[in-house]
Interface confidence: medium
């Protein structure tokens, strides 16, 4: 039970996170104009990693893409680069944890190779968590040195919205809610590698118990083990049949919550 | 080179209308705010109308609201200014003005005016 | 409406003086003001914008200062050119507006 749902839980939040860090990735908002000493006739302006946008101050708003790779930063490069890796990753992640939840089950998959395969997701999360944080904290270090505002003039060729009046600019929504999808993304992927361990099948020695019966003598192995003759033998037991009690977390399973954000 | 050149004023008659323009170069009009700013002779400088740089939000002054119409054609490179019902106390030199960036209502480059005369 | 308060609104002075002009808004304007000149049959020019910003091209004699609602243009070293009227202008709020001008003139 505790394996499953740590498993299920893990998929839930990573599925949570990922959604996260697609949506941070596409928001407009990674950095905004800081409103704190801005006059009302100023046009808000609010930039992200594809385009810049502007808010007029009767409302309409205006966005405008980066409409070269060249003439942009390398750290905002990087931090597109970081996203969408986070992004593949996660995806990738979350396509082989499916298959490696216990409550699916496909053809005769061997609970070793679902763990292998809850590991693997488990370490993709965790990349993809890590991904995301790094470059969501990239951009965030970027505003914080004023890096945005030295390079806010290479953005005349990107639709020309140019900015000569020093504006001020703060961390947007979009930070927020990539540090956030992140945590998620690796806390679910940590959960993942957790629920690995509760998965692979313990290849225990037991110690044979001897019983003294009139004419052969018997090593009983207990619980789904087939028993084998020998006396005292202290040979590694395979598992035949899978009709031996069972776990309460291999009878019962929960059903993974799809979400997007 | 920026330059900003107006047109269309003259003489009318109060109750009249007039439309002025003001051709742009040298810069990428459709990036920045235009403005039309007014003075009357002898006197000060006076705001009449803000329009943004594209083209969606108009500001104007009171006196000068319902009455006067700004707009812009980005592929024309052209502000237009379109005037009704004139009064006397409109007559004035009509300057087109850029504004600094998209988003302040600083004018760095005006151009050489056009004169409104509004008499009878 | 924010009103601009220019004093003096004329001002004589010789070549070589350190001329000041004051602006004082009606309300706070933070540092949202701009500093024009204006020669006769021209048309203003930029010459300060976000009250103490010099604009590129302009001699770094002029400069201004202040916050709120007090603000001062100030031209260190008088030069002939620089006989000529100035106005200051806000844009923290609709509708813009001028001051009602100051005018420099040879002493």
């Known amino acids: 039970m505790a394996v499953t749902a740590c498993q299920g839980l893990g998929f839930v939040v990573s599925l949570i996170g990922i959604a996260g860090i697609i949506a941070a990735t596409c928001m407009d908002q990674w950095s905004t104009q800081d409103l704190y000493n801005n006059p009302v006739t100023a046009v808000f302006n609010y930039q992200g990693l594809w385009r810049s946008c502007v808010r007029e101050s009767s409302g309409f708003t205006e966005c405008r893409g980066y409409f070269t790779l060249l003439g942009l930063p390398a750290m905002l490069q990087a931090v597109r680069a970081l996203m969408i890796v986070g992004i593949v990753l996660g995806a990738i992640g979350l396509l082989v944890s499916i298959f490696a939840l216990k409550c699916i089950r496909i053809g005769s998959m061997e609970d070793s190779a679902k763990a292998n395969m809850t590991l693997t997701s488990g370490i993709m999360f965790i990349v993809s968590g890590l991904c995301a944080i790094a470059g969501v904290s990239v951009f965030a270090n970027m505003l914080v040195t004023n890096f945005w505002m030295s390079t806010a003039n290479m953005y005349t060729g990107m639709g020309g919205m140019v900015q000569t009046v020093q504006t001020r600019y703060t961390f947007g929504a979009a930070l927020f809610v990539g540090w956030v999808a992140g945590g998620l993304t690796l806390i679910g992927g940590v959960m993942m590698c957790i629920a690995c361990r509760g998965l692979a099948p313990e290849e225990t020695n037991y110690k044979a118990v001897s019983y003294h019966a009139s004419g052969h003598s018997v090593a009983y192995k207990p619980g789904g083990f087939k028993a084998s003759t020998g006396f005292g033998s202290n040979t590694k037991n395979k598992k035949i049949y899978d009709g031996g009690a069972r776990t309460e977390d291999e009878v019962q399973s929960y059903p993974s919550k799809h979400d997007y954000v | 080179e920026v330059q900003l050149l107006e047109s269309g004023g003259g003489l009318v008659q109060p109750g009249g209308s007039l439309r002025l323009s003001c051709a742009a170069s040298g810069f990428t009009f459709s990036s920045f705010a235009m403005t039309w700013v007014r003075q009357a002779p002898g006197k000060g400088l006076e705001w009449v109308s803000s329009?943004?740089?594209?083209?969606?939000?108009?500001y104007y002054a009171a006196s000068m609201k319902g009455r006067f119409t700004i707009s812009r054609d980005n592929s024309k490179n052209t502000l237009y200014l379109q005037m009704n019902s004139l009064r006397a106390e409109d007559t004035a030199i009509y300057y087109c003005?850029?504004?600094?960036?998209?988003?302040?209502?600083?004018?760095?480059?005006w151009g050489q005016g056009t004169l409104v005369t509004v008499t009878s | 409406d924010i009103q601009l308060t220019q004093s003096p609104s004329f001002l004589s002075a010789s070549v070589g003086d350190r001329v000041p002009i004051t602006c004082r808004a009606s309300q706070g304007i933070s540092n949202f003001l701009a500093w024009y000149q204006q020669k006769p049959g021209k048309a203003p020019e930029l010459l300060i914008h976000?009250?103490?910003t010099l604009q590129s091209g302009v001699p770094s004699r002029f400069s201004g200062s202040g916050s709120g609602t007090e603000f001062t243009l100030t031209i260190s070293n008088l030069q002939p050119q620089d006989f000529a009227t100035y106005y200051c202008?806000?844009?923290?709020?609709?509708?813009?507006?001028f001051g009602g001008g100051t005018k420099v003139e040879i002493k």
């Open positions: 976000s009250a103490s």
């Open positions: 329009l943004s740089g594209s083209g969606r939000s108009t």
């Open positions: 202008q806000q844009v923290n709020s609709y509708p813009l507006t």
């Open positions: 003005a850029k504004s600094l960036s998209y988003y302040h209502y600083y004018f760095d480059y």
